[in-house]
């Protein structure tokens, strides 16, 4: 949502976590702020104190409950406000009716492993985390791999169009040192977008057997 | 139905302070702001600045800071603005008036009847 | 401070006729969400201002819908469309988008 000069821009995790940044130009420096949630038809508010992340930027997490507690669903409406101090009032900076369902972004992937690895091929898998039981098997993923010498922006993005907690990453050089991350999306949602990538998992290859045809 | 009633005029000497009271009914008194705004005799309107009665948060426009004091009672919904160090010039009818403690569409919508403090020698 | 100066300080109008004030204010008073917090208030003669105008142009409940407010960035206008006898007193315009804040000098409506 936009107001005047100021983008108000909100994830759902799909559980209970609602995360909120509000970048405004030539905004006032030493004025508290904060994201207001009012959903449309539960008996709870939510309030969250904004924090800078950057010259014109705030983000904050709006906590609705423990993190596997589904606090929200398909149908629920929730009116997000940026209020901001002036004076002793607080004054509406910008002002959405959110819908969870359609701006989607889950939590990043989390206890990736090694299964097996050899010296051209390594198997791994992950689980994802606070992810809503809506969505069933309706999830993608995107893996990436970092060869020595490269950059993540140079990996080759490999796209997994179904739920599928694991991959076997094959054509690897012997004996090398490799890092892998993998994200994840629900395919419901207009406005839902990847969620951060994992922490990146560090691996080697096996070496190759001395005396034999690699 | 809301209603701000304000105590009853005043006749000070220079130098001397004033306290102006403001009782609240008709609404929850702590959900609400509390401005205080003065008019000099046929002059205009001046906002003097207002509370917060949920908290007793106060803020004081910088023309009256130093000078003015303003607390609350909540036990009885009643707002106080105290105006020290009166000199001739601070005649004038002060009103309080309920302000919305989001400031969403306007400042001020109910007010009460107005206090008029003379400061004369 | 945001200076807001009326025109004309006194307007004596015609029963029925229509009749205009104007708000000018020294410096833009849109906030910085976007919004514009000028209010209009009403003085009748031994009364406490009452709120007629608020964000420009949207009455408040209960104000008659003869009264309007226009304008923006720093030009503004309160327009009774047919004066009423309980109309006199002195109107106020006011702005909110900037602490402190302040209000105009008041223009005196009377009955020619």
């Known amino acids: 949502a936009v107001n005047g000069t100021s983008q108000f821009t909100c994830f759902y995790n799909s559980r209970a976590n609602i995360s909120c940044v509000w970048s405004q130009d030539g905004a006032l420096q030493d004025t508290s702020c904060q994201v207001h949630a009012w959903p449309d038809r539960r008996r709870w508010n939510q309030t969250c104190e904004l924090l800078p992340v950057s010259q014109a930027s705030w983000a904050c997490n709006l906590i609705l409950g423990a993190p596997d507690s589904q606090k929200l669903t398909t149908v629920d409406i929730v009116t997000l406000r940026v209020l901001c101090r002036e004076g002793v009032r607080w004054r509406v900076m910008a002002i959405q009716d959110f819908k969870p369902f359609e701006n989607l972004r889950l939590m990043a992937p989390i206890s990736l492993q090694v299964v097996h690895v050899e010296t051209h091929r390594c198997n791994i898998s992950w689980e994802i985390s606070q992810a809503s039981h809506y969505f069933e098997r309706h999830l993608e993923f995107e893996a990436r791999t970092l060869s020595p010498g490269h950059t993540w922006e140079e990996a080759p993005l490999l796209t997994l169009k179904q739920k599928q907690e694991w991959i076997c990453l094959e054509t690897l050089t012997p004996d090398t040192q490799y890092e892998f991350q993998v994200r994840v999306k629900p395919l419901q949602g207009e406005f839902t977008t990847w969620s951060p990538w994992s922490q990146p998992l560090a691996f080697r290859t096996k070496p190759a057997a001395l005396g034999k045809d690699t | 139905e809301v209603q701000l009633v304000q105590s009853g005029a005043e006749v000070k000497k220079p130098g001397a302070s004033v306290k102006v009271s403001c009782k609240a009914s008709?609404?929850?008194?702590?959900?609400?702001?509390i401005s205080w705004v003065r008019q000099a005799t046929g002059q205009g309107l001046e906002w003097m600045g207002e509370i917060y009665p949920g908290d007793g948060n106060t803020y004081y426009n910088e023309m009256f800071k130093g000078r003015v004091t303003m607390t609350r009672d909540t036990s009885i919904s009643t707002a106080y603005m105290e105006l020290s160090s009166l000199r001739s010039e601070d005649t004038a009818v002060y009103y309080c008036a309920r302000g919305s403690y989001t400031y969403d569409n306007y400042a001020m919508d109910f007010w009460g009847q107005g206090t008029t403090v003379t400061v004369s020698s | 401070d945001v200076v807001m100066t009326q025109t004309p300080l006194s307007l004596p109008v015609t029963l029925g006729q229509p009749a205009s004030i104007s708000c000018r204010s020294s410096q833009n008073i849109v906030h910085s969400n976007g919004n514009t917090y000028l209010e209009w208030f009403q003085q009748r003669p031994g009364q406490s201002p009452r709120l007629l105008i608020y964000k420009v142009s949207n009455r408040f409940s209960g104000v008659p819908d003869r009264f309007s407010g226009s304008g923006s960035g720093t030009d503004f206008t309160l327009k009774i469309s047919r004066v009423e006898a309980e109309d006199v007193g002195v109107y106020y315009c006011?702005?909110?988008?900037?602490?402190?804040?302040?209000f105009g000098g008041g223009t005196k409506v009377e009955i020619k």
């Open positions: 008709g609404y929850t008194f702590t959900d609400y702001v």
């Open positions: 006011f702005q909110g988008s900037h602490i402190p804040w302040t």
